[in-house]
């Protein structure tokens, strides 16, 4: 049986059940290389409290559909008096990056995971030439996830003192320049994740090969190498390589630019101080507030919730968007879709789409940007579920009793963007994490 998601095959992936202190290793096409789980384990569970290993999915006992992968075992389990077998179930959804498998829950018999990934899309519009896993768990099983830094088009400019060259990078995947026909970036060779431009020439100095690594707490490393044989004439016989070290800052701060810290014989070392390198619980909340010692800040957007069936309305030219954030109030237009953001076509108000659901909510504060994300909306033709990204700005003089109002700013590939100036986005900082 052919592997269902070939892009995911090259790596062993990790997921964590934080509540029970369990680390899962997943290899969806072969077996994980862990002796204690046996030679054919596709999903290996490591219980860190009891220091035991169990195979909870066998690569030989795999069954697959387009959106579900199940690995059975021969191990019996007791579920409500019936004799079942232990199994793992991975539900796949379309995403814009390779993404990460997320542990959902486990019963006596079944270990459930969910994975939003380009590999599950109906169309190839989000697929990279080359992409590697962009997250890692540290020794305390805390997740560090750089997926939000991945650019689907364009690149980051590396701060370099050399006026004659420009070094462009992407994070964990190659640079897509197709949407910018006029700039220097256009000359970058396909597949490159680190592109050096000198004059009118552009050179591939690195492609992603291995996934993100953690070198020590709050320091993550990504390495790019030039795969192609043949040396560049300005590299003194060496093969180019790029090492990007992502550093979690010791306290809250605005984002910084990736900086070139060393360069010799086409070996480029880049340091990027960014809060995205911090563990995810420091940056994100599933509620509408971020507070407490762990986050170093106090943010509470819950006063923006609308009561009594009313919604915020944002005009999107062809569409009207109805928003009801930070609550579970149904938007009247949205046909019981549990939508936090509802898109209604002006010319045909029967055309209604959920552009993100209120139980699929993430509040993120990172590098000085406060963002509320609603995902899991109605599917687009690519298979991607509509989502909304609301970028908040602090405005102490916002109208509507300080609440302000969301403004639709654009749509790209079924992601809807809004900005929202409000006094409730004014962040109160504590110190040190």
């Amino acid at each position: 049986q052919a592997a269902p998601f070939p892009e995911l095959c090259s790596y062993t992936w990790e997921a964590v059940d934080t509540k029970n202190n369990v680390l899962y290793k997943i290899n969806i096409c072969g077996s994980v290389d862990i002796v204690q789980c046996g030679p054919s384990s596709a999903v290996c569970m490591h219980d860190l409290d009891t220091r035991t290993y169990h195979s909870v999915g066998d690569s030989v006992l795999r069954s697959a559909t387009r959106s579900l992968l199940e690995f059975n075992t021969t191990v019996s389990c007791d579920q409500q008096g019936t004799n079942h077998r232990v199994q793992s179930s991975i539900a796949f959804l379309c995403g814009k990056t390779l993404g990460t498998p997320e542990f959902v829950t486990a019963t006596e018999c079944v270990h459930y995971f969910e994975w939003r990934t380009t590999a599950a899309c109906k169309k190839d519009i989000f697929k990279a030439n080359k992409e590697v896993p962009c997250y890692v768990f540290d020794e305390e099983l805390r997740k560090h996830d750089l997926n939000p830094l991945i650019k689907l088009s364009g690149a980051y400019l590396v701060d370099d003192s050399d006026p004659d060259t420009s070094l462009f990078i992407n994070v964990c995947r190659d640079i897509d320049t197709l949407r910018d026909p006029g700039s220097q970036l256009r000359a970058c060779p396909p597949g490159t994740a680190a592109c050096l431009v000198r004059g009118h020439q552009a050179f591939d100095v690195g492609q992603p090969r291995d996934g993100l690594k953690v070198v020590r707490k709050d320091r993550l490393v990504l390495s790019y190498v030039r795969e192609e044989a043949g040396k560049l004439d300005f590299c003194d016989g060496h093969s180019p390589a790029v090492t990007i070290t992502f550093v979690c800052p010791s306290e809250r701060r605005e984002g910084t630019i990736p900086k070139l810290t060393a360069k010799s014989n086409c070996r480029y070392e880049i340091e990027w101080i960014t809060e995205y390198a911090c563990h995810r619980d420091y940056l994100e909340s599933k509620t509408c507030s971020l507070s407490g010692e762990q986050q170093d800040v106090s943010i509470d957007l819950t006063p923006l919730a609308q009561s009594g069936g009313s919604s915020y309305i944002s005009d999107g030219k062809e569409y009207l968007f109805y928003l009801n954030v930070c609550g579970e109030t149904e938007i009247q237009f949205c046909n019981k879709k549990q939508a936090a953001v509802c898109q209604v076509k002006k010319s045909d108000t029967s055309q209604v789409k959920a552009a993100g659901r209120y139980h699929n909510q993430t509040l993120r504060y990172s590098d000085g940007d406060l963002t509320l994300i609603y995902f899991g909306g109605d599917e687009c033709s690519s298979g991607f579920q509509r989502m909304s990204v609301i970028n908040f700005e602090c405005n102490k003089t916002a109208g509507n009793d300080g609440k302000g109002t969301p403004v639709f700013t654009g749509e790209v590939d079924c992601t809807y963007f809004f900005t929202w100036d409000t006094e409730y986005a004014c962040v109160h900082h504590h110190h040190h994490h």
Epitope: G154, D159, F168, T177
Partner: nanobody, 123 residues
Framework: QVQLQESGGGLVQAGGSLRLSCEAS????????WGWFRQAPGKEREFVAA????????SYADSVKGRFTISRDNAKNTIYLQMNSLKPEDTAVYYC????????????????WGQGTQVTVSS
């Protein structure tokens, strides 16, 4: 690709003010960085100010800091350059540009450009 159209240039006395506008059309969210540049006769095109579309993060050339302010109105897909305390050396053609490169002020990294609007500051 995005199309850009500037307006608001003109003749003004030293110490006066002008507000330039730049309206963007096309798939504006595929660009992340919006900039104003200027070019005086016989000189290279130089960076003036930049703003990111998804947030209010801004950067300025040292020569205009404290006098010029870049802003945006997402609802109108428009960016602005408010120019106060104008000096004769601010005389130039001002261009609006868009880039898919983050953290750049280099004009060669901007792939989309407007036609420019003339600003003349008399003493």
């Amino acid at each position: 690709q995005v199309q850009l159209q500037e307006s608001g240039g003109g003749l003004v006395q030293a110490g006066g003010s002008l507000r330039l506008s730049c309206e963007a059309s096309g798939r504006t969210f595929n660009t992340y960085n919006w900039g104003w540049f200027r070019q005086a006769p016989g000189k290279e095109r130089e960076f003036v100010a930049a703003i990111r579309w998804s947030s209010s993060k801004t950067s300025y050339a040292d020569s205009v800091k404290g006098r010029f302010t870049i802003s945006r109105d997402n609802a109108k897909n428009t960016i602005y350059l408010q120019m106060n305390s104008l000096k004769p050396e601010d005389t130039a053609v001002y261009y609006c540009a868009a880039s898919i490169v983050d953290f750049t002020t280099n004009p060669s990294h901007f792939g989309s450009w407007g036609q420019g609007t003339q600003v003349t500051v008399s003493s």
